[in-house]
Amino acid sequence: MMTGTIETTGNISAKKGGSVILQCHLSSTMAQVTQVNWEQHDHSLLAIRNAELGWHIYPAFKDRVAPGPGLGLTLQSLTMNDTGEYFCTYHTYPDGTYRGRIFLEVLESSVAEHSARFQIP
């Protein structure tokens, strides 16, 4: 039985040209996290963090994606095209797969404040 919950940074905004941290947190389960996948809105994989093998940043994103902090992902040099949904997929043992959603809005305005709070989707 899957008892865990994915908490995410929910809906966040950040400035064009800036950076943002995408963060998911698995709680309420003792399951072991074996792998975390990060996907973009078009379902293309940005990165994988395998507990035994390490991080893999897909080549198309290597110049703008940095691993961490933790199991999270840092997007850099944001463009307006980065606006959209991002998904974290947690492969766990023995529970199975958990999935979280984050919506990122990239703003032109210099007054955009990076708002990030954990929420349960």
Epitope: N50, A51, L53, G54, H56, Y58, P67, T97
Partner: antibody, heavy 119, light 107 residues
């Protein structure tokens, strides 16, 4: 053109040592995990280990069959991968391939170099 | 360690025919499975990764399927150049392991 070319194979006596090299070209070497895989004559492929990429600190992992005897290293300035093999045994006789991995599957392979361990 | 069991060990087929090779993982590996083709005296070549994604330049007569512990590689409309050995490999944990191989021969 993406290419991997191994060298350094040959005949070695049991207990001896040998170093294999793999010259990489056509891609950004530091972005990729680099692996060694071997294949004894007429047998299956066996993953020996890898050295991680720059983002993962160039750390290494090895299979149990070679851990402590084999060492993987890389010269990033020259785009060369190495496999230092010590305390060689007859069962180490095989064709040795270097392979680039993307998300831990092997998307580019070298042509292979042959090691024979025999007295 | 995750063990990969391939079957059959060998099979013979005719040009134009269809074959299916199966691979079983000893543990759940989601869709993290790759298939390789190796011709006699040559290096292996990546065919499929993530269980069903064809590698660049691989013809559509090859198809991969499966998830969890059971996987298969299907080759339709066999061509003379398709004969050789095929290996599966999981890309999910350490150590990375291959199946024992399937030798596809011309009938």
């Amino acid at each position: 053109d993406v290419q991997l070319v191994e060298s350094g194979g040959g005949l070695v006596q049991p207990g001896g040592s040998l170093s294999l090299s793999c010259a990489a070209s056509g891609f950004t070497f530091t972005d990729y995990y680099m692996n060694w895989v071997r294949q004894p004559p007429g047998k299956a492929l066996e993953w020996l280990g890898f050295i991680r990429n720059k983002a993962n600190g160039y750390t290494t992992e090895y299979s149990a069959s070679v851990k402590g005897r084999f060492t993987i290293s890389r010269d990033n300035s020259q785009s060369i991968l190495y496999l230092q093999m010590n305390a060689l045994r007859a069962e180490d006789s095989a064709t040795y391939y270097c392979a680039r991995s993307t998300a831990w599957y092997f998307d580019v392979w070298g042509t292979g170099t042959t090691l024979t361990v025999s007295s | 360690d995750i063990q990969m069991t391939q079957s059959p060990a060998s099979l013979s087929a005719s040009v134009g025919g269809t074959v299916t090779i199966t691979c079983r993982a000893s543990e759940h590996i989601y869709s993290y499975l790759a298939w390789y083709q190796q011709k006699q005296g040559k290096s292996p070549q990546l065919l499929v990764y993530n269980a069903k994604t064809l590698a660049e330049g691989v013809p559509s007569r090859f198809s991969g399927s499966g998830s969890g512990t059971q996987f298969s590689l299907k080759i339709n409309s066999l061509q003379p150049k398709d004969f050789g050995s095929y290996y599966c490999q999981h890309h999910y944990g350490n150590p990375l392991t291959f199946g024992a191989g399937t030798k596809l021969e011309l009938k």
